[in-house]
């Protein structure tokens, strides 16, 4: 028989999405046991029928990768989990409506920081996503978000920071003191979607000035 409250077997059914990798996660409820099994279905918003996710039927782990199934950027999706206990009790819970564009969070960018004598160069590498274009190429975040820009900061001392930003991939902070350590932070920002990545940090030291030796 079904439990009085589905939360006894199943809680917190939600998508966790980062750089468009969309993972469905959930927790077992207080009545859940290690041998409780979970089956996952998903559907596109507006469709009537649920589709069973292959590889996520009668599983005991509490996550299921739905990246491929929810890969259309213009669609909205739902997923649901059905938990069945060893005693035959079952409960089903559905996610909120999911939009990868809206809900995905951004990981820190991949950056190369290069020391020079009086400057520090930062080269941002485009971030790939699991989403494939029609030609088979993987889309980068730059392909998806028109307004994506990079915000770079260089901590010069306790009270002074230098800032650069833009849609370019190469930046250079000039006018620095040779043989000095600096802390750089680089973030991805997408203002129209109110997204900001955690920062990539690099601690770099300008090269010594050999011209005087």
């Amino acid at each position: 028989h079904a439990p009085e409250d589905p939360s006894d077997l199943l809680q917190h059914v939600k998508f966790q999405s980062s750089n468009f990798e969309n993972i469905l996660t959930w927790d077992s409820g207080p009545e859940g046991t290690p041998d409780t099994v979970y089956s996952i279905e998903y559907k596109t918003y507006g469709e009537r029928d649920w589709v069973a996710k292959k590889g996520c039927q009668r599983i005991t782990r509490k996550s299921c990768n739905l990246t491929v199934e929810t890969g259309n950027l213009t669609e909205l999706y739902y997923a649901r989990v059905t938990a069945v206990s060893a005693g035959g009790r079952s409960a089903t819970k559905m996610t909120d409506r999911f939009s990868s564009l809206q809900h995905t969070t951004l990981k820190p960018p991949d950056v190369t920081c290069i020391s020079k004598v009086r400057s520090i160069q930062m080269i941002v590498h485009p971030t790939p996503t699991p989403i494939r274009a029609g030609d088979g190429h993987r889309l980068t975040l730059e392909d998806i978000f028109h307004d994506l820009f990079y915000h770079l900061e260089l901590q010069v001392n306790r009270t002074y920071q230098m800032h650069l930003g833009g849609k370019q991939r190469e930046y250079e902070f000039f006018g620095l003191t040779p043989d000095t350590e600096f802390l750089g932070t680089i973030m991805i920002c997408v203002p129209t979607w109110a997204k900001e990545s955690a920062p990539y940090m690099c601690r770099v030291k300008t090269l010594p000035d050999r011209t005087w030796t």
């Epitope: 274009a133 889309l139 028109h146 820009f149 915000h151 650069l164 930003g165 833009g166 849609k167």
Partner: antibody, heavy 117, light 107 residues
Framework: EVQLVESGGGLVQPGGSLRLSCAAS????????MYWVRQAPGKGLEFVSV????????HYVESVKGRFTISTDNAKNTLFLQMNSLKSEDTAVYYC??????????WGQGTQVTVSS | DIQMTQSPSSLSASLGDRVTVTCQAS??????LNWYQQKPGQAPKLLIY???RLRIGVPSRFSGSASGTSFTLTISGVEAEDLATYYC?????????FGQGTKVELK
Amino acid sequence: EVQLVESGGGLVQPGGSLRLSCAASGFTFSSSWMYWVRQAPGKGLEFVSVINTRSGITHYVESVKGRFTISTDNAKNTLFLQMNSLKSEDTAVYYCATRIQGLIDYWGQGTQVTVSS
Amino acid sequence: DIQMTQSPSSLSASLGDRVTVTCQASQSIRSSLNWYQQKPGQAPKLLIYGASRLRIGVPSRFSGSASGTSFTLTISGVEAEDLATYYCLQEYAWPLTFGQGTKVELK
């Protein structure tokens, strides 16, 4: 050398349609953001639409939504702007432009669109 | 949409004059501002990007600066070839929006 060459402009009656083309060369067209920008006679510049040639993601300015459609033919390195239900206020020179290495730095020479009865 | 208020709409300058054009954004756009030069019958040409970074090949008499949501283009000594219309462009968020333009004429 980057080159953008627009064509397809002309005189059209209000309510009519026109399809602009922009032939691109000298850069990787299949992974770029491409724009249509217009300039009404004696007026300023206005971004009309943008498309990412790889993802197909598009954006439009509010005044043309539902009337204009931006698209590409990546095999032919060509950008299009299908303009329907044209109004007199759409009269302008239409430029295509591209963003290369983060900069909107390359523009075509423009094609004139006149909407008049 | 982000509004860009550009001033003055026109100005007269003598050759060698220092000229400044300003743009005010209706909200924060960080440093996502470009300056373009346009001559009659031509497409716009990028001069400054990122509020203050000079495009390669652009003469050093052009410079850009920013303070909060206010941006300035300065021509330190106007030459005859600089007589044109100048536009600021915010690239922070779609729709990208230009200022109304500043026509620089000879006095």
